[in-house]
């Protein structure tokens, strides 16, 4: 196990992650439902789940909650248990995500619904669905600070990035995004590397010359397409596309970012802001590793708990992603990526073994919450019984841990197919993406499977059902590696499930006569939203307990159960992390003191709004940032970085009233725009209409039920497609221009070519 | 080389619905929207929308919305369109493209909805 | 929707010959950034379309210099010179400005 104690990353960015835009499961959780990958894992395997609308077209995209984005406290309520403030992890600075990550890298992409994450975590609590990161089980940073911790990351439950990253999402399988978040820059990376640049021939340059092919299609996201749902158009599962079986969920998972910890506190979203300006937090360097490829056996975790009193709490996340090297995630397994994306090759490869954590120092002027850390030692074995290749050496050594730091980019560049865009291909060669800021874990380690994905298309007759029309070749949709973990079920939108092909895809000119009844859109049963998993009724704030028997019967199936988990000390511990016993590490009393101190802003680069103008409205619940005529462009951070937002526990609404939104072309705003932002059709008008950023996925408050900032601007623009800027999906494609969901066709299509270097 | 496989036919009768599929091949699928065109036997062509491989995400034409679905299965890089409650205005060569630009199409598949 | 109208060319040209095509929108096509999102793409008989000049102004790979669009806005020009046999189909163009795409009605080209 990569370190024992791994502390699972907060991940900063998750914000974008849940409720990017994907589908919003119960409990607001946005499911995203990683197409592949939580087919892979089990997760919800929706064959062809309707993806989301990019929500371009509809504000409300065809999955009407595709879009919705958990409240925040949807996100940061799980599991964390408020009562022991002492427990709170650390806040994790709030790591903005550099602009050339792309939203998976940076962890941004859609992330598995707490659901599918809590179904199947580890020892989750049957009811919190959530795990806690350890991360956030690390040492108790200042009281609250558990809560802003989550809040840092956006929309990220306390979950790790969810099954579907343990799942490890076949390469290039994702969830649908629908769109959604690679930061501009990124999307245009993509999209220009990817459609034009990809094979076909190089398009001519304006001159008619041809443009060099893209050296390298870098298929950054294909690896980890998180959010959609649809991707499997038949549930047929097929095999994760790394063959793992979904079951490798447990991405090397050197540490289960979904162990619970019990005595997590949710923190408060101000902490955030508070960490995010005081907490320096070391991003992890190294690239996400996805498991090694080929690890097919389902791992067995073991978590070994150790929880050592009074150790003090580092600061730094040194070892960050320790855990991150060990969890196969899918490299860069889209939002979730742990890292930055590896390439689809580069699941990881023979990444060095990070350097032990090293405690980082705290932040000045913070003392270090000495507080029992709970270092759970994921063992995660093979079906051979060996643990991966992290987990085996490290299964006890809470020094081995990797750190991804430094974690050489791996990911082996896909070699550009010739460019036989007609377009020009520039490709950017794959370059080690920036490991995201906050990479995210995966915790379910058991990857539930969806009733949905249980439920097989059946073929439908000629008699009128829906048939399947497979080119030859092509295997049916669905084929994706079944978890065999149960999962909680999921509505599945009828999903055409095109038979596997028989070895012999259907010959082009035959009629598939596939019809499989339950394929999606049987007349009248075609539901573009994607189904909704329903996800078992988390309560907010569960402290997850570490027992290992699963004891809600879903978790039960969806967690492996892990052989008796050695917790070593555990007898020793008499308290649940979250139990009372530890609140006296709190002299609040488990009260978790959201102080919401005013952030000098200035510092705070946020590209909802200039800094200058946020006000932070203690009293208020909703904080108003009012928008003077903001030149956005230089803004960099992102939109509704909880940073930026200072959500106000009874904040209920962050409105951010831009008088004049200027994107700039420069404006290179996660929040969705591209840097071409503003290439409005509509003649330029740079102004957005009212459009609501639901900063749900980035307000985190508990409190905060998904505050929406609302984005009001005066001018109309004369966009017929508002951008929609709380769309922001990490899409791989070189079309990424879905992500951020730009104001107009041309728009995505500028920024596409762009990617292309066209 | 780019290459987008369409099944040559398909023949369904009305009210029913059918699953139109699109293999992509020589590029890295996740990386390019792939759109659905229809084509009546008037020559017109009419966008029916397109979904983001990578993301899932997708953009309907309005009036196509209550009629087609477009879902993608990333293992085998193919991309499917059902089409729901077909009648015989859905008869019409169902092309796949990909790309922003529709740089590449496939070769269409001929749906005749027929009773 | 963004209306593409396309005239058809009901008189036959003769190879070698240069022809236009026209095509008008309904909008302008000239984006903020100053790019022409206007796509034309070939339809030979029984083949599906393929794109000849994309953002009004390039060629795609492959595709002859023969082909040239001219105009601006909402009106534009596809000139062929020297039309040679490969080049019969139906021409389409293409507004990439606003969703829905849209194509205009095709105008065909048919060689004497």
């Known amino acids: 196990m990569a370190e024992p104690r791994q502390e699972f990353e907060v991940m900063e960015d998750h914000a974008g992650t849940y409720g990017l835009g994907d589908r919003k499961d119960q409990g607001g959780y946005t499911m995203h439902q990683d197409q592949e990958g939580d087919t892979d894992a089990g997760l919800k395997e929706s064959p062809l789940q309707t993806p989301t609308e990019d929500g371009s077209e509809e504000p409300g995209s065809e999955t009407s909650d595709a879009k919705s984005t958990p409240t925040a406290e949807d996100v940061t309520a799980p599991l964390v248990d408020e009562g022991a403030p002492g427990k709170q992890a650390a806040a994790q600075p709030h790591t903005e995500i550099p602009e050339g990550t792309t939203a998976e890298e940076a962890g941004i992409g859609d992330t598995p619904s707490l659901e599918d994450e809590a179904a199947g975590h580890v020892t989750q609590e049957p009811e919190s669905g959530k795990v806690v990161q350890e991360g956030f089980l690390r040492e108790p940073g200042p009281p609250g600070l558990s809560h802003q911790l989550m809040s840092g990351m956006p929309g990220a439950p306390l979950l790790p990035e969810g099954p579907r990253e343990a799942t490890r999402q076949p390469s290039g399988t994702g969830p649908e995004d629908t769109e959604g978040g690679r930061h501009a820059p990124e999307l245009l990376k993509h999209q220009l590397l990817g459609d034009l640049h990809q094979e076909g021939p190089p398009l001519k340059g304006a001159g008619g010359k041809e443009r060099p092919g893209s050296k390298e299609e870098v298929d950054e996201d294909r690896d980890v397409d998180e959010s959609s749902p649809q991707d499997s158009p038949p549930s047929k599962a097929s095999p994760a596309q790394d063959g793992r079986p979904p079951q490798t969920a447990a991405r090397e998972a050197t540490s289960i970012p979904g162990f619970p910890a019990e005595g997590a506190i949710p923190l408060p979203v101000d902490f955030l802001s508070k960490v995010s300006t005081e907490i320096p937090a070391s991003e992890p360097d190294g690239p996400s590793v996805g498991r090694a490829k080929g690890q097919d056996a389902p791992l067995e975790f073991t978590f070994h708990v150790e929880i050592t009193p009074n150790v003090q709490k580092e600061q730094a996340h040194s070892e960050e992603h320790l855990g991150r090297a060990a969890f196969p995630g899918a490299p860069g397994e889209g939002p979730e990526a742990r890292g930055p994306s590896l390439g689809e090759d580069t699941k990881e490869a023979d990444l060095p073994e990070p350097s032990e954590k090293q405690p980082a120092a705290a932040p000045r002027g913070k003392p270090v919450s000495r507080v029992p850390q709970l270092k759970a030692r994921m063992v995660s074995k093979s079906k051979d019984g060996t643990g991966s290749d992290d987990k085996k050496a490290k299964t006890s050594t809470r020094s081995s841990a990797k750190t991804l730091k430094n974690r050489p980019c791996l990911s082996p560049k896909h070699p550009t197919p010739g460019s036989s865009d007609p377009l020009i291909q520039p490709s950017s060669p794959a370059v080690c993406p920036e490991p995201p800021s906050s990479p995210k874990y995966v915790s379910s380690v058991t990857s539930r499977t969806g009733s949905s994905g249980a439920k097989e298309m059946k073929l439908k007759g000629a008699d009128g059902k829906t048939k399947i029309a497979t080119p030859r070749g092509a295997a049916p949709p669905g084929q994706k590696g079944q978890a065999n973990a149960t999962r909680i079920p999921a509505k599945t939108p009828p999903a055409p499930k095109t038979p596997p092909s028989s070895g012999e895809p259907p010959k082009s000119g035959d009629r598939s006569g596939y019809s499989s009844p339950g394929s999606p859109g049987t007349p009248g049963s075609r539901s573009r939203t994607p189904s909704l998993p329903t996800p078992p009724t988390r309560e907010p704030k569960k402290v997850a307990v570490v027992r290992t028997p699963p004891k809600s019967p879903s978790s039960a199936k969806s967690r492996l159960q892990t052989a008796p988990v050695p917790m070593p000390d555990l007898k020793n511990v008499k308290s649940k992390i979250g139990s009372t016993e530890n609140l006296k590490h709190q002299p609040g009393g488990g009260k978790v003191q959201i102080i919401n101190k005013k952030l000098d802003l200035s510092n705070v680069q946020s590209k909802c709004g200039s800094k200058d103008n946020i006000k932070h409205v203690p009293g208020g619940g909703s904080v108003q940032i009012v928008y003077k005529p903001v030149d956005l462009s230089k803004v960099t951070s992102k939109c509704g970085s909880l940073g930026n937002i200072h959500h106000k526990p009874g904040g209920g609404q962050v409105e951010v009233k831009s008088e004049k939104l200027d994107f700039k072309d420069r404006v290179q705003s996660k929040i969705g725009s591209l840097d071409n932002i503003t290439h409005v059709p509509g003649g330029g008008n740079k102004k957005i209409e009212t459009h609501k950023l639901t900063f749900r996925e980035n307000a985190k408050a508990k409190t905060d039920h998904g505050a929406e900032i609302v984005y009001k601007s005066p001018v109309v623009s004369g966009d017929t497609s508002p951008r929609h800027l709380s769309n922001v999906s990490s899409t791989g494609s070189i079309d990424m221009v879905d992500s951020p969901q730009l104001a107009t066709l041309a728009d995505e299509v500028s920024a596409s070519l762009a990617k292309q270097g066209l | 080389q780019v290459q987008l496989q369409q099944p040559g036919a398909e023949l369904v009768r009305p009210g029913a619905s059918v699953i139109l599929s699109c293999k992509a091949s020589g590029y890295t699928f996740t990386n390019s929207w792939i759109h659905w065109v229809k084509q009546r036997p008037g020559r017109v062509l009419e966008w029916i929308g397109r979904i983001d491989p990578n993301s899932g995400g997708t953009r309907y034409n309005e009036n196509f919305k209550s009629k087609a679905t477009l879902t993608v299965d990333k293992p085998s890089s193919t991309a499917y369109m059902q089409l729901s409650s077909l009648t015989s205005e859905d008869s019409a060569v169902y092309f796949c493209s990909r790309g922003v630009l529709h740089d590449y199409w496939g070769q269409g598949t001929t749906l005749t909805v027929s009773s | 929707d963004i209306v593409i109208t396309q005239d058809e060319l009901s008189n036959p040209v003769t190879s070698g010959e240069s022809v236009s095509i026209s095509c008008r929108s309904s909008?302008?096509?000239?984006?903020?950034?100053?790019?022409?999102?206007l796509n034309w793409f070939l339809q030979r008989p029984g083949q599906s379309p393929q794109l000849l000049i994309y953002l009004m102004s390039t060629r795609a790979s492959g595709v002859s210099d023969r082909f040239s669009v001219s105009g601006s806005g909402t009106d534009f020009t596809l000139e062929i010179s020297r039309v040679q046999a490969e080049d019969v189909g139906v021409y389409y163009c293409q507004q990439l400005v606003e969703y829905p795409y849209t194509f205009g009605g095709g105008t065909k080209l048919e060689i004497k």
């Open positions: 909008k302008s096509l000239l984006y903020k950034d100053g790019k022409t999102y």
